[in-house]
């Protein structure tokens, strides 16, 4: 009778084991072990027992002891069970960002590991078990579906293998995959709201505001604002689940025309975009052209109003005929035209919006000098010793210099309060002089003597 010890062994992969083969007869013809494993016989006294060291045990094996005794041949098997933890425990790669409400499939793959009967695969969220299944197949695969929730944000998902050899007197061997950190997000289906000027004048600044609410986590949202190829640098303010991005946009002559303004919000692996057109225009103030800004009385003056080729102008409130960017009027300069304003108003329609500009020029009319009865009376009669103010106003542009002299030497104090004396009586020659010429006028002062009764 052949016997083997131990009859059952659990050992780590690549390990060694001592197996004793024994026989019940004293003088066996033959006693040995049959195994593909490397073996080394340890020398022992006696003929009915042999000890073998079996090494580099890589897989389950059933070495067989045999003996040949006079009463016949017999065999005995020992059962070697190899254990080893999996070589690979991995969660199938997933995008780290997942939208809330999506069904997320977690897939764990386990390569290797034995004995499989003692190997379990566990899927976890943090420390919470989601699914536990025995490892089946090579590689073993365990899947579970998770409905992504907002509160899953930042949660770690992992896969753990448990090789439980406690019933065999060994321990529980655990292997854990690298964690998958879930980033959950909510990006609403509504595009961001974009508020900006529809039209913008070159060399000016405009303000663009892009906003969106219903976002989670709002701090992770990326906002891209651009006008054409010009990337804008917004200041972003965040609310609980909203943001508002405000940017200044400066435009130059090179930007003229219709430009695309875009606001893109990127969160997770999704984006929402809003497009708007902004028309960049150039509209210099209209020009008021006077043939000469300063003319003499009686001169013919042409006033021209010229604006942007697509503008419509009015000159002093009168529309151009035909409707367009140019208007003009002709006038013969009179003293009343001195200081007259000529206003050119231009309206430019840009993308349906009306833009208004104007410019005003003043005409200077040179005239005079003038001395007339109304402003410089020819006769004054004043009582002696009364207080009087001689008045004589010369008109003209430029304002004439006025002198009133009696006998070429004695001046009349124009505009000053004087006490009337006999010396004041007489005829004065008032002379008004300017660059435009000279006029004279005789003024007579009569002094009434008081009557003595």
């Amino acid at each position: 009778q052949t016997s083997v010890s131990p009859s059952k062994v659990i050992l780590p992969r690549g390990g060694s084991v001592l197996v004793t083969c024994s026989t019940s007869c004293d003088q066996p013809k033959l006693l040995g072990i049959e195994t593909p494993l490397p073996k080394k016989e340890l020398l022992l006294p006696g003929n009915n027992r042999k000890v073998y060291e079996l090494s580099n045990v890589q897989e389950d094996s059933q070495p067989m002891c045999y003996s040949n005794c006079p009463d016949g041949q017999s065999t005995a098997k020992t059962f070697l069970t190899v254990y080893w933890t999996p070589e690979r425990v991995e969660l199938a790669p997933l995008p780290s960002w997942q939208p809330v409400g999506k069904n997320l499939t977690l897939r764990c793959q386990v390569e290797g590991g034995a004995p499989r009967a003692n190997l379990t695969v566990v899927l976890l969220r943090g420390e919470k078990e989601l699914k536990r299944e025995p490892a089946v197949g090579e590689p073993a695969e365990v899947t579970t579906t998770v409905l992504v929730r907002r509160d899953h944000h930042g949660a770690n998902f992992s896969c753990r293998t448990e090789l439980d050899l406690r019933p065999q007197g060994l321990e529980l061997f655990e292997n854990t995959s690298a964690p998958y950190q879930l980033q959950t997000f909510v990006l609403p289906a509504t595009p961001p709201q974009l508020v900006s000027p529809r039209v913008l004048e070159v060399d000016t600044q405009g303000t663009v505001v892009c906003s969106l609410d219903g976002l989670f986590p709002v701090s992770e949202a990326q906002v891209h604002l651009a006008l054409g190829d010009q990337r804008l640098n917004p200041t972003v303010t965040y609310g609980n689940d909203s943001f508002s991005a405000k940017a200044s946009v400066s435009v130059t002559a090179e930007d003229e025309g219709t430009q695309r303004l875009t606001c893109a919000v990127i969160l997770g692996n999704q984006s929402q975009e809003t497009l708007q057109t902004v028309t960049i225009y150039s509209f210099p103030a209209p020009n008021v052209i006077l043939t000469k800004p300063e003319v003499s009385e009686g001169t013919e003056v042409t006033v021209k109003c010229e604006a942007h080729p697509r503008a419509k102008v009015t000159l002093n409130g009168v529309p151009a005929q035909p409707l367009g960017p140019r208007a003009q009027l002709l006038l013969k300069a009179t003293p009343e035209d001195n200081g007259r304003s000529f206003s050119c108003s231009a309206t430019l329609e840009v993308a349906g919006q009306l833009i208004h500009k104007n410019q005003t020029r003043e005409l200077r009319v040179l005239y005079g000098p003038r001395l007339d009865e109304r402003d410089c009376p020819g006769n004054w009669t004043w009582p002696e010793n009364s207080q009087q103010t001689p008045m004589c106003q010369a008109w003209g542009n430029p304002l004439p210099e006025l002198k009133c002299l009696k006998d070429g030497t004695f001046p009349l104090p124009i505009g000053e309060s004087v006490t009337v004396t006999r010396d004041l009586e007489g005829t004065y020659l008032c002379r008004a002089r300017s660059t435009q010429g000279e006029v004279t006028r005789k003024v007579t002062v009569n002094v009434l003597s008081p009557r003595y009764e």
Epitope: R198, V199, R310, K312, V313, T314, L315, N316, G317, V318, P319, P322, L323, S343, C344, S345, T347, E349, A351, G352, Q353, L354, H356, N358
Partner: antibody, heavy 122, light 110 residues
Amino acid sequence: QSVEESGGRLVTPGTPLTLTCTVSGFSLSNYYMSWVRQAPGKGLEWIGIISDSGSTYYASWAKGRFTISKTSTTVDLSITSPTTEDTATYFCARDWSYDSTSGYYYYDMDLWGPGTLVTVSA
Amino acid sequence: AYDMTQTPASVEVAVGGTVTIKCQASQSINSWLSWFHQKPGQPPKRLIYKASTLASGVSSRFKGSGSGTQFTLTISGVESADAATYYCQQGYSRSDGEHVFGGGTEVVVK
């Protein structure tokens, strides 16, 4: 000075229709013209405008559904593919004025036609 | 876009009374605002332009005021003939996608 719409009639959904606005007493080369519609029992709804030079602008809901064009004395409104929601009275209005104080032009519907009724029904 | 908000949607007034209709623009339109009224089966008729200027042939009982974004139409000494729907209209822009008219105010005269 007057404007008058014509071409309104009963059409089946999807049948293209063109309305015409005929002007007299002023030149279309000096004015912008707008089309406005009014569904039964509803308010005034601006459809679009054509400028003195022929540029056109449309309300967002009207883009692609309507086309405005003009000749020297008429302004046309084409309804590409009418639906029952397009049942309304369609008005043509002169939409351009100027302020003699500032000298600026502005949009103002100072002259209206009597309107033409379009009924879209299967 | 220039949105025009008109209030109230409907108002009842006794003959001889006063009625006030407000129109608010979402952005400044300076003084480029007109008021119209419309009676059933008729085209709109312009009452006021440039916010406060009375159109020719319109009774001085109609008064327009305001500038920028807030405008008011006041009808004093209301007559039965004033029963109509009143609309404001901005004259600042006809850009693509623009709103031109307010929603309208129905004036019912008792």
